[in-house]
Amino acid sequence: LMGGQDKPFLSARPSTVVPRGGHVALQCHYRRGFNNFMLYKEDRSHVPIFHGRIFQESFIMGPVTPAHAGTYRCRGSRPHSLTGWSAPSNPLVIMVTGNHRKPSLLAHPGPLLKSGETVILQCWSDVMFEHFFLHREGISEDPSRLVGQIHDGVSKANFSIGPLMPVLAGTYRCYGSVPHSPYQLSAPSDPLDIVITGLYEKPSLSAQPGPTVQAGENVTLSCSSWSSYDIYHLSREGEAHERRLRAVPKVNRTFQADFPLGPATHGGTYRCFGSFRALPCVWSNSSDPLLVSVTGNPSSSWPSPTEPSSKSGICRHLH
């Protein structure tokens, strides 16, 4: 971690990607501890914050401006050496977001994937970004960076993620940067939740009063399992939405969630998945598909007033 015997290690918490106006803590780890240290910015811009000052354990930077973006190093206190300071640390790049219009982020073939598959996350914009950056929420290391490809007035980059395993599930955002300001990034794209399925045993899905109902009749879909899932997710084929509910322990020692669909107007094929609170983006195998048929007078679509978009919120905890 240290890199060399006399070389400190500079890191950022919570992330090297900082929104404009946000704060970040820089830690200089030297000789098995956090000692007094000095900070340097490589391009020498915006140096008044350092002004020969010595920091103790960590330096809290912010509210950040575009001028804070750049490469930093630290030197640890070394009282008995000739200079009193260690060799320079590793370079740490701080990127400041919110400086240009946000790009768009799409998943191909989609955001719901089986363990072991590969997904392409495409970041694109009509702003001519030179580089695109992909960052996963909660990760402190640098984001992935790709050169933007420009075609028909659109710049884009395809990030290949995989083979997918639980550690790669989560909320992704992408950013763009323009030439000459490589660390001054755009506003983040809308968040995209990448969900990995197939890790745990499948729950069972049933319909009350049954899978075939009269138009207008109230239908509830029940998802249950012997596994102690915290959350159940219900998806309908052909819809880019999922509904989720907290699992409730039942007297028969199963864990169940009941999804009220309301008055039946239109059939469809449903599946449900279970997940645990600690890993909200890692789901079970899919239940067997359940075909719900509506007899009588079907109209456009089932009302679903509480459906959140699958593009955001899945990987956040249900409170």
Epitope: R13, P48, R53, T65
Partner: antibody
Framework: QVQLVQSGSELKKPGASVKVSCKAS????????MQWVQKSPGQGLEWMGW????????KYAEDFKGRFVFSLDTSVSTAYLQISSLKAEDTAVYFC???????????WGQGTTVTVSS | DIVMTQSPSFLSASVGDRVTFTCKAS??????VAWYQQKPGQSPKLLIY???TRHTGVPDRFSGSGSGTDYTLTISSVQAEDVAVYYC?????????FGGGTKVEIK
């Protein structure tokens, strides 16, 4: 959105102690620090010092060394200012404000009035 | 300690006026100057930092400029809701210090 909510007004006798709390919400508490600012009657704003919420290390302005202590409880995202051996001249409004090593105070608590009177 | 001297201490303006407050530091503070607005009965609010960077949500009628020891805050078109005391602060070196404030009233 960032919010700092301070404890209510206090009326204390000289020699007593007081502890003012400042509960933060809307951001990750340990990525910023908490600055403390005093506004005495008829006076301007005076910086008392700050505490680094990431490391827990406090720093005090010269006039506020000794009887003034900054502390944290990161589990409840709260910063505290404790003043001991209160004097009449400690009568003031005390503000907490989010800020770090750069000294910019971007969000402020509503202020806590401490009155010291016999 | 760096002394921040604000002028004027009081200013009366009409709605729509352009007003400028000045702040002089006792030494070069290298653009590390912030401005705060404190409305009656409220806590201070950050307007500007690093001389000219507007804080989130601050209307663009507020702008800052300056370098070395001389800094200004300008309200391009004063509104009734701008009645407040405005403080400058240097964030160049500790102890951070504030100016004495400029009180703005509307005629």
């Amino acid at each position: 959105q960032v919010q700092l909510v301070q404890s209510g007004s206090e009326l204390k006798k000289p020699g007593a102690s007081v502890k003012v709390s400042c509960k933060a919400s809307g951001y990750t508490f340990t990525t910023a620090g908490m600055q403390w600012v005093q506004k005495s009657p008829g006076q301007g704003l005076e910086w008392m010092g700050w505490i680094n919420s990431h490391s827990g290390v406090p720093k005090y302005a010269e006039d506020f060394k000794g009887r003034f202590v900054f502390s944290l409880d990161t589990s409840v995202s709260t910063a505290y200012l404790q003043i001991s051996s209160l004097k009449a001249e400690d009568t003031a409004v005390y503000f907490c404000a989010r800020g770090g090593d750069e000294g910019v105070m971007d969000y402020w608590g509503q202020g806590t009035t401490v009155t010291v009177s016999s | 300690d760096i002394v921040m001297t604000q002028s004027p201490s009081f200013l009366s303006a009409s709605v729509g006026d352009r007003v400028t407050f000045t702040c002089k530091a006792s030494q070069d503070v290298s653009t590390a100057v912030a401005w705060y607005q404190q409305k009656p009965g409220q806590s201070p609010k950050l307007l500007i930092y690093w001389t000219s960077t507007r804080h989130t949500g601050v209307p663009d009628r507020f702008s800052g400029s300056g370098s070395g020891t001389d800094y200004t805050l300008t309200i391009s078109s004063v509104q009734a809701e701008d009645v407040a005391v405005y403080y400058c602060q240097q964030h160049y070196s500790t102890p951070w210090t504030f100016g004495g404030g400029t009180k703005v009233e509307i005629k």
